[in-house]
Structures are given as structure tokens and as C-alpha cells.
């Protein structure tokens, strides 16, 4: 069982949070396309979280392809220090608060909220259920906490921590999982398995956040939610690593998978877009 292939490592609060992307195409694998040219291009590697060089064949491929390193960085990376731990008293909003509301390409329309930078308010929109961007919140309250100006002189960031304006200390927010743990993975790992609306019976895996394990379920072939993986390994990689166990002294123990040879394969369920 691959679940046993795990190690326990002490980590600090400053470890990078789960990867969340401003543009979903940044999660696509490098695609050289079917043609045979040799063109130096750059793509964003979600595993290293860096822009890297690859050879493009000259036709087709996908949007995770940039002429220059600078363009790649501009589209797919952010200044993590400024984004996650806001060090100034102004507490700038996360940059995704300024993105236009994006319904994505799917059609399983559900109510979500986005921050409207024109009205300076969080507003409702209809999200199609996949892709889109991070200006996309399950609740009005979550949107307000993250993107609207807080009444008490603080801004709440996107990773469940609240910045105290007096001393800039980070205060963990409460979570919906058992108190021994905090979940810092993608939010869909906390959702129940959802068969969807069609009639197929595909073998899939979902993360059961109650027992902390990936379990099989039958997927109908359409609809459902993002807690849906084609293999147990993918499920574990996306969700299991998100649980962090608190130690009484304030240190952290994180259960994370040993990095074996990574397959650079991205399915929809692996795209870390906010609250998909």
C-alpha cells in the first residue's frame, strides 16, 4: 500500500502553502506539440514552482508556453513573501482580488462570490465548476475576509491566517477538520465524494477527510466535484500532504509523501484553483 510510503518531517510555519495558481494554464504540463521545430520556450513547473526552459516543436501545444522567462514569471509566479505574509501596515489585498470574475469553461453552474474592484464589494456570480481563477469564494464572508478592507484594521489572507495590524503576527484561523489537525491543502479535499449526473461507472478515488485516507468510489462520468482522482497516488499527493498535525509546543509535524519520480501529468483535479 502506497500510504505506508510516507515520512514525517518537522516543518515551520513559513513553509510554502499549497500551490494556488493565478491562471489555471500554469498547471498544464509542458507540451512540445506534434511539430518538429526546435524552439526554446519557457513553462511553469508546478512541482518546482518555477519557470523552466523546454523545447517547443512550433505548433499546437498549450497556453503554458512563454517566449521569455520574464513573461512566464509574470503570468505564473508571485512574490510569495508579499502575497502570503503581508509585512506592511497597509496590508495590500492579494493580487487575485483584482482579477475579473471568471466562470471557467465548464457548465455545472454554482453560486460563488468574487471581489469587484470597481464597487469594492464582494458580489455573486455563477461559476461553471472548473478552472477559472482565485477570485472565487464559496461564501460571501470568505470573500469579504480576504478581499474587502476589514473594519478592524486587519486583512485576512488566503491561507487561513489573519494578520494582526498591531504587531503583524500571524494568527491561525479555525478550520472544519478535527482540532488535532489543520488542513492546508486544496479545499475540495474536504468535500464528499460526488458521483455526478451521468450513467458511467468509472473507478475513481476521493479523499475522505474524516478518516484521512483516499477511498475508491464510482464516478458517473460527468459533473461531481474536484475531490475525484484517477489513482490513489494522485489522491494522496493532492490531499494527504495538506494535513498538518500541531504539536503542543507549537511546532508542526507534516505528513508528506516521499518524492519518487514525479510524473508531470495534470488532470483537472490537480489544478489548485481557489475553492474549485
Amino acid at each position: 500500500d502506497s500510504e505506508e510510503d510516507e515520512e514525517h518531517t518537522i516543518i515551520t510555519d513559513t513553509e510554502l502553502p499549497p500551490l494556488k495558481l493565478m491562471h489555471s494554464f500554469c498547471a498544464f504540463k509542458a507540451d512540445d506539440g506534434p511539430c518538429k521545430a526546435i524552439m526554446k520556450r519557457f513553462f511553469f513547473n508546478i512541482f518546482t514552482r518555477q519557470c523552466e526552459e523546454f523545447i517547443y516543436g512550433g505548433c499546437e501545444g498549450n497556453q503554458n508556453r512563454f517566449e521569455s522567462l520574464e513573461e512566464c514569471k509574470k503570468m505564473c509566479t508571485r512574490d510569495n513573501a508579499n502575497r502570503i505574509i503581508k509585512t506592511t501596515l497597509q496590508q495590500e489585498k492579494p493580487d487575485f482580488c483584482f482579477l475579473e470574475e471568471d466562470p471557467g469553461i465548464c457548465r455545472g453552474y454554482i453560486t460563488r462570490y468574487f471581489y469587484n474592484n470597481q464597487t469594492k464589494q464582494c458580489e455573486r456570480f455563477k461559476y461553471g465548476g472548473c478552472l477559472g481563477n482565485m477570485n472565487n469564494f464559496e461564501t460571501l464572508e470568505e470573500c469579504k475576509n480576504i478581499c474587502e478592507d476589514g473594519p478592524n484594521g486587519f486583512q485576512v489572507d488566503n491561507y487561513g491566517t489573519q494578520l494582526n495590524a498591531v504587531n503583524n503576527s500571524l494568527t491561525p484561523q479555525s478550520t472544519k477538520v478535527p482540532s488535532l489537525f489543520e488542513f492546508h491543502g486544496p479545499s475540495w479535499c474536504l468535500t464528499p465524494a460526488d458521483r455526478g449526473l451521468c450513467r458511467a461507472n468509472e473507478n475513481r478515488f476521493y479523499y475522505n477527510s474524516v478518516i484521512g485516507k483516499c477511498r475508491p468510489f464510482k464516478y458517473s462520468g460527468c459533473g461531481g466535484n474536484e475531490n475525484n482522482f484517477t489513482s490513489k497516488q494522485e489522491c494522496l499527493r493532492a490531499c494527504k500532504k495538506g494535513f498538518i498535525q500541531r504539536i503542543s509546543k507549537g511546532g508542526l509535524i507534516k505528513t508528506k509523501r516521499k518524492r519518487k519520480k514525479q510524473r508531470v501529468k495534470i488532470a483537472y483535479e490537480e489544478i489548485f484553483v481557489k475553492n474549485m
Epitope: E100, E101, D102, Y109, T111, Q118, T119, Q121, R124
Partner: antibody
Framework: EVQLVESGGGLVKPGGSLRLSCAAS????????MNWVRQAPGKGLEWVST????????YYADSVDGRFTISRDNAKNSLYLQMNSLRAEDTAVYYC???????????WGQGTLVTVSS | DVVMTQTPLSLPVTLGQPASISCKSS???????????LNWLQQRPGQSPKRLIY???KLDSGVPDRFTGSGSGTDFTLKISRVEAEDVGVYYC?????????FGQGTKVEIK
């Protein structure tokens, strides 16, 4: 006062094209998603299309998807509907309507009549 | 798509008397955010639609308080406590909970 004024309607043959416009005033146009809704003669209302605040993303009714294109020019406070491959069943009064913060239509224009007939 | 069914389709009323229009949806209009996005429009003869009520019971600004909206789930009602001449027209319910937005067939209110 919020005002929405549609124009561009008229008589067109089946298979033809038409471009409707909606001029908005009295509010900050770029702050609002916008819609087109139509009403066939003597019939009820049918939602046609919605465009997001910045104009990058769109929603369409199945009946018009692939034939109609909604767009906007925030600098000109204008909403557009490009209608191609028109059919007799597209005959209707076309209204533009503003979307409020609840993603609900609040203000409507006076409408422009599109007649598709040979 | 969600089907909205209005009754009656025609409603002759006497001035000063109450009127009531029913609207039923084919599925619940309670959204995942706990709100119910059921709305009412008024379309006077020869005019464009005007929003009267949103979120079941909230009156738009300038709408007289003789109009009231109520209901939950799949059953909704628009009531006019005392009909006035300016209330003549077609009233539509429509839902904004599920996409695409869908409308009722309309109820024509006329004076007897």
C-alpha cells in the same frame, strides 16, 4: 438615473446577421455584468446572454450558443450583441439588462425589435 | 432548466380589490448560499420590464408597499393589497438561483 438604450434592430433575412447595441448611462458601466434578454411577439421572456464586468467571459443560452456573440466596450459604456445565422425563431424584442451584485437583473432598457423573415 | 409556472395566466380584478399571483418552480430555488433568488417583474403595456421584487420579498426602490412577495422552496406568491389603475400589465416571476435564468409565462392583470 440608470438608462439603457438599445439600437440596431430591424428586418433581416434568415441566415443573415445583425449587431445590436446598448448605450448605458447613469452608472459606472464597468462595475456591472450585463445581459441580453429577448421577448418573442406575444410570448414570455428568455434570457440570451451575460457578459462579465471586464468583458473577458461570457455565458449563452443553448438556443443561441455558437451563433450570437456578446461583447462590451467599457470605455464607450456600450454593450453589443452580434447575431449571426439568424432564424425565424430569433424574432423578438431584445432588451439589455444590468446585473446587480446579487447576479440578478435590476434595470432594463426599452428594447429593440429584431424581425427575421424572408 | 428550471421551469417556472405561473397561475393564473389572466387575472381580471376590480380597482381597490386585492390580487394574488402564484409562481411554482420545478425545483427548489434555495441556493447553496442560503438565499432564494426568486424575483418579480412588472411590464406595463408598451413598456419594458421593471423589477418589482427580488430575493422573494425585497421591494425595489420606488415600488409601492401594496406589493408584497412571499414563499419559499418551490412555491411563491405576489400579492397586490389594493389594485390601482397603474398596476395593469403583465407580471413575470423569474429565478436567478439556477443557471440559466428562467421566467414564468407571465400573468396579465387587467381591470374588470
Amino acid at each position: 438615473e440608470v438608462q439603457l438604450v438599445e439600437s440596431g434592430g430591424g428586418l433581416v433575412k434568415p441566415g443573415g446577421s445583425l449587431r445590436l447595441s446598448c448605450a448605458a448611462s447613469g452608472f459606472t458601466f464597468s462595475s456591472y455584468a450585463m445581459n441580453w434578454v429577448r421577448q418573442a411577439p406575444g410570448k414570455g421572456l428568455e434570457w440570451v446572454s451575460t457578459i462579465t464586468t471586464g468583458g473577458s467571459y461570457t455565458y449563452y443560452a443553448d438556443s443561441v450558443d455558437g451563433r450570437f456573440t456578446i461583447s462590451r466596450d467599457n470605455a464607450k459604456n456600450s454593450l453589443y450583441l452580434q447575431m449571426n445565422s439568424l432564424r425565424a425563431e430569433d424574432t423578438a424584442v431584445y432588451y439589455c439588462a444590468r446585473q446587480d451584485g446579487h447576479f440578478l437583473m435590476d434595470y432594463w432598457g426599452q428594447g429593440t425589435l429584431v424581425t427575421v423573415s424572408s | 432548466d428550471v421551469v417556472m409556472t405561473q397561475t393564473p395566466l389572466s387575472l381580471p380584478v376590480t380597482l381597490g380589490q386585492p390580487a394574488s399571483i402564484s409562481c411554482k418552480s420545478s425545483q427548489s430555488l434555495l441556493d447553496i448560499d442560503g438565499k432564494t433568488y426568486l424575483n418579480w417583474l412588472q411590464q406595463r403595456p408598451g413598456q419594458s420590464p421593471k423589477r418589482l421584487i427580488y430575493l422573494v420579498s425585497k421591494l425595489d426602490s420606488g415600488v409601492p408597499d401594496r406589493f408584497t412577495g412571499s414563499g419559499s422552496g418551490t412555491d411563491f406568491t405576489l400579492k397586490i393589497s389594493r389594485v390601482e389603475a397603474e398596476d395593469v400589465g403583465v407580471y413575470y416571476c423569474w429565478q436567478g438561483t439556477h443557471f440559466p435564468f428562467t421566467f414564468g409565462q407571465g400573468t396579465k392583470v387587467e381591470i374588470k
